[in-house]
């Protein structure tokens, strides 16, 4: 650590009076402390001299020795006052600017230590200071305000009590900073904006921020627009708002509008996009396939998007057949807004009937007309089978019939024993038939399809089954000769006599 | 070894506020005087003002309306903001260490500042 | 506030003796300090107080003063020499402010 000669902390002199102040380290070392005038500066390897031959009142301060080499960074400090009965005050700064919640140090340091008892710190012009001010001295650094708020932003005096009189220093302006968390706030409104040519248009950029010192501009297609701008305050923020009013739109006024402001923490910007068409539209969309299956007993929402300006007159849903004449609840129906052009309309169809299959179609309208999108809904069915025994063209002949959709397919298991179903132990035979005979396949109805299969002799210890499936599911139909006659099981159903 | 960085940007449009942020990098901001200096294109040096780490502020009376000068212990940075700035404020800014008022002795290497539109 | 005055321009012949002064009110209270600028480049401090050299600053750049002038002497001028130097102190309102002499560009022949 360095060592100052004199070795005293603190050093009393009278104007006019020679200080020589000497600073001794290992290696260089250097002279710090507050800007003042006659002070000559000497350096002599690891020794440096500050002198003055003419002390003034504005000598009066803390002067601090480092050695920049001295990797512990220590330092001794000596503190002078130059004691003028004419001048208490040496004040260091005419301003101070801290940021809110800070301690502000108001820089008056009294040149003579006997003058403390009497010091004071007032507003100018003799006013007091405000109510909540937290304050304290220090004779070597002056008047610190603590936790600075911004409304202590002021102008200040030190005071001192020098024969029964108050002697004022010269005013300090003390600046207290919101402190500003980052660039400024901002909002430019409308989002998204559509007009048809010669109709009004308003886009409003505004910024706030704790801190007036902030710039904001609206600019359209990199054109910085020069509009007017409103300055206000309120919340504890400053705003600022420019307003472009346009009377009659036009398609050169289309087009990337942003809004931009900065400060020194940095800039935001946001920016929208302005549409000028030629009339009014409405488009009606789906992200839907417009064809749609659903097994029976689930549940469907339909979803139609609609782009359209201007808004909306009327819209809803509607129920084409072929079933039945009733229409949607309307409680169903849901309708949300993107934004301010883009909409979702949803039909829910929950727990599908057999006869909600069909058609559905949503109308909207505005100016621009009428316009629909119609879905098709088919429901799937697992297949339904029944077996009965016949003869065609004298032969006996096993015929299925299995309605389902999809369309089933259609598989002949010959098993020995009589049972409900073939299980794989029992089989014999199996045939499949590739080629059913489609008996109905009407829109949104179940496809009902027969298959044949000619038996020479039923043998009467065996069962022939009938299986048909499809994506939904798969049904069956065992068929038991017995010698009464041919004896039929539907699954889990008990054996009956046609 | 104590050394200055100036950053901020290089183009300002006229009206809008300068700002540049000063880093001191090898030692503590918490001690010595810290000063913003300029020098336009092909002219002398033309001091803006300093900060002390308290605070405490001085500036070019030229130039007083119009400056603020700011001190960030934590980041050990000083900043500058020159409000309503015009042509006349295109220049070189330079940040500097004063020693006792007598001397600078320690200089960043400068930043550049445009003022157009 | 002071103003500090400077030549605009001096030229000194290689290896000769050069003056450089700068002149203002001020430096009746206070030292000047001397700086050299290379283009493009940031000032370096070369004299201050009375006649004090930063380290790495060569020992043919002096500084001296008399009433309201101060002097910066380079003996032996080096061609590395040719630069701007310009001179600084603070004003005499006695409010700590800074002033700038206007610069000598120093040409070497």
């Known amino acids: 650590i360095p060592v100052i000669e004199p070795s005293v902390p603190e050093l009393v002199v009278k104007p006019g009076a020679t200080v020589t102040l000497r600073c001794v380290g290992n290696g260089s070392v250097e002279w710090d402390g507050p800007p003042s005038p006659h002070w000559t500066l000497y350096s002599d390897g690891s020794s440096s001299i500050l002198s003055t031959n003419n002390a003034t009142f504005q000598n009066t301060g803390t002067y601090r020795c480092t050695e920049p080499g001295d990797p512990l960074g220590g330092s001794a400090a000596i503190h002078l006052y130059v004691k003028d009965p004419a001048r208490p005050w040496n004040v260091l700064a005419q301003e101070v600017v801290v940021f809110e919640d800070q301690d502000a140090l108001l820089p008056c340091l009294l040149t003579d230590p006997v003058l403390e008892a009497g010091v004071s710190l007032v507003r100018v012009r003799g006013r007091p200071l405000m109510r909540h001010t937290n304050y304290s001295f220090s004779p070597w650094h002056g008047f610190t305000i603590h936790r600075a708020k911004f409304i202590q932003s002021q102008d200040y005096q030190c005071s001192a009590l020098m024969g029964g009189r108050k002697v004022m220093s010269i005013s300090i302006r003390l600046k207290v900073q919101k402190v500003i968390p980052g660039p400024p706030a901002l909002t430019l409104v409308p989002a998204e904006l559509v007009r048809i040519r010669g109709e009004a248009a308003q886009i409003v950029c505004s910024a706030s921020s704790v801190d007036v010192n902030f710039d904001v501009f609206l600019q359209h297609n990199n054109t910085k627009l020069a509009i007017p701008q409103q300055s206000d305050f309120h919340n504890n923020r400053y705003q600022k708002v420019l307003t472009l009013n346009l009377d009659q739109v036009d398609f050169q006024h289309a087009g990337n509008y942003s809004c931009v402001a900065s400060n020194v923490q940095g800039k935001h910007s946001t920016s929208m996009f302005f549409r000028v068409v030629e009339s009014a539209y409405l488009n009606l969309s789906s992200e839907q396939n417009l064809i749609q299956e659903v097994t029976v007993g689930e549940g469907l929402n339909l979803k139609v998007m609609v782009e359209a300006y201007p808004g909306l007159q009327g819209f809803n849903w509607t129920y084409l057949g072929p079933f039945s004449d009733h229409q949607p609840e309307p409680k169903l129906a849901n309708a949300t807004t993107k934004d301010t052009y883009r909409h979702t309309f949803t039909l829910s169809l929950p727990r599908l009937k057999p006869s909600e299959a069909g058609r559905y179609s949503f109308l909207a309208r505005n100016p621009g007309g009428w316009r629909a999108l119609t879905f098709e809904l088919t429901l799937r069915y697992p297949p339904e089978v029944s077996v009965i025994w016949t003869f065609i063209n004298g032969s006996g002949t096993l015929l299925c019939a299995a309605s389902g959709y999809p369309q089933p397919n259609v598989t002949w298991l010959q098993c020995s024993g009589h049972t409900d179903r073939c299980d794989e132990a029992q089989v014999l035979q199996v045939w499949d038939d590739p080629y059913p005979e489609v008996l109905s396949q009407e829109p949104f109805h179940k496809v009902t399809v027969q298959s044949l299969l000619t038996v020479e002799t039923l043998e009467h210890n065996q069962t022939y089954e009938c299986r048909a499936h499809n994506s939904v599911g798969s049904g069956s139909w065992a068929f038991i000769p017995i010698s009464a006659g041919a004896h039929t099981h539907p699954p889990d159903e008990f054996l009956f006599t046609p | 070894q104590v050394q200055l960085q100036e950053s901020g940007p290089g183009l300002v449009k006229p009206s809008e506020t300068l700002s540049l942020t000063c880093t001191v990098s090898?030692?503590?901001?918490?001690?010595?005087?810290w000063s913003w200096i300029r020098q336009p294109p092909g002219k002398g040096l033309e001091w803006i003002g300093y900060?002390?780490?308290?605070?405490?502020?001085n500036y070019n009376p030229s130039l007083k309306s119009r400056v603020t000068t700011s001190v960030d212990t934590s980041k050990n940075q000083f900043s500058l903001k020159l409000r309503s700035v015009t042509a006349a404020d295109t220049a070189v800014y330079y940040c500097?260490?004063?020693?006792?008022?007598?001397?600078?002795?320690?200089w960043g290497q400068g930043t550049m500042v445009t003022v157009s539109s | 506030s002071s103003e500090l005055t400077q030549d605009p321009a001096v030229s000194v012949a290689l290896g000769q003796t050069v003056r450089i002064t700068c002149q203002g009110d001020?430096?009746?209270?206070?030292?000047a300090s001397w700086y050299q600028q290379k283009p493009g480049q940031a000032p370096i401090l070369v004299i201050y107080?009375?006649?004090n050299r930063p380290s790495g600053i060569p020992d043919r750049f002096s500084g001296s003063s008399s009433g309201n002038t101060a002097s910066l002497t380079i003996t032996g001028a080096q061609a590395e020499d040719e630069a701007d130097y310009y001179c600084?102190?603070?004003?005499?309102?006695?409010?700590?402010?800074?002033?700038f002499g206007r610069g000598t560009k120093l040409t070497v022949l």
């Open positions: 107080g009375k006649n």
């Open positions: 900060v002390y780490y308290s605070g405490s502020t």
């Open positions: 500097a260490r004063d020693r006792l008022g007598i001397a600078f002795d320690i």
């Open positions: 090898g030692g503590s901001i918490s001690s010595y005087y």
């Open positions: 600084n102190s603070q004003d005499n309102s006695g409010n700590h402010l800074v002033v």
């Open positions: 001020s430096l009746r209270s206070y030292y």
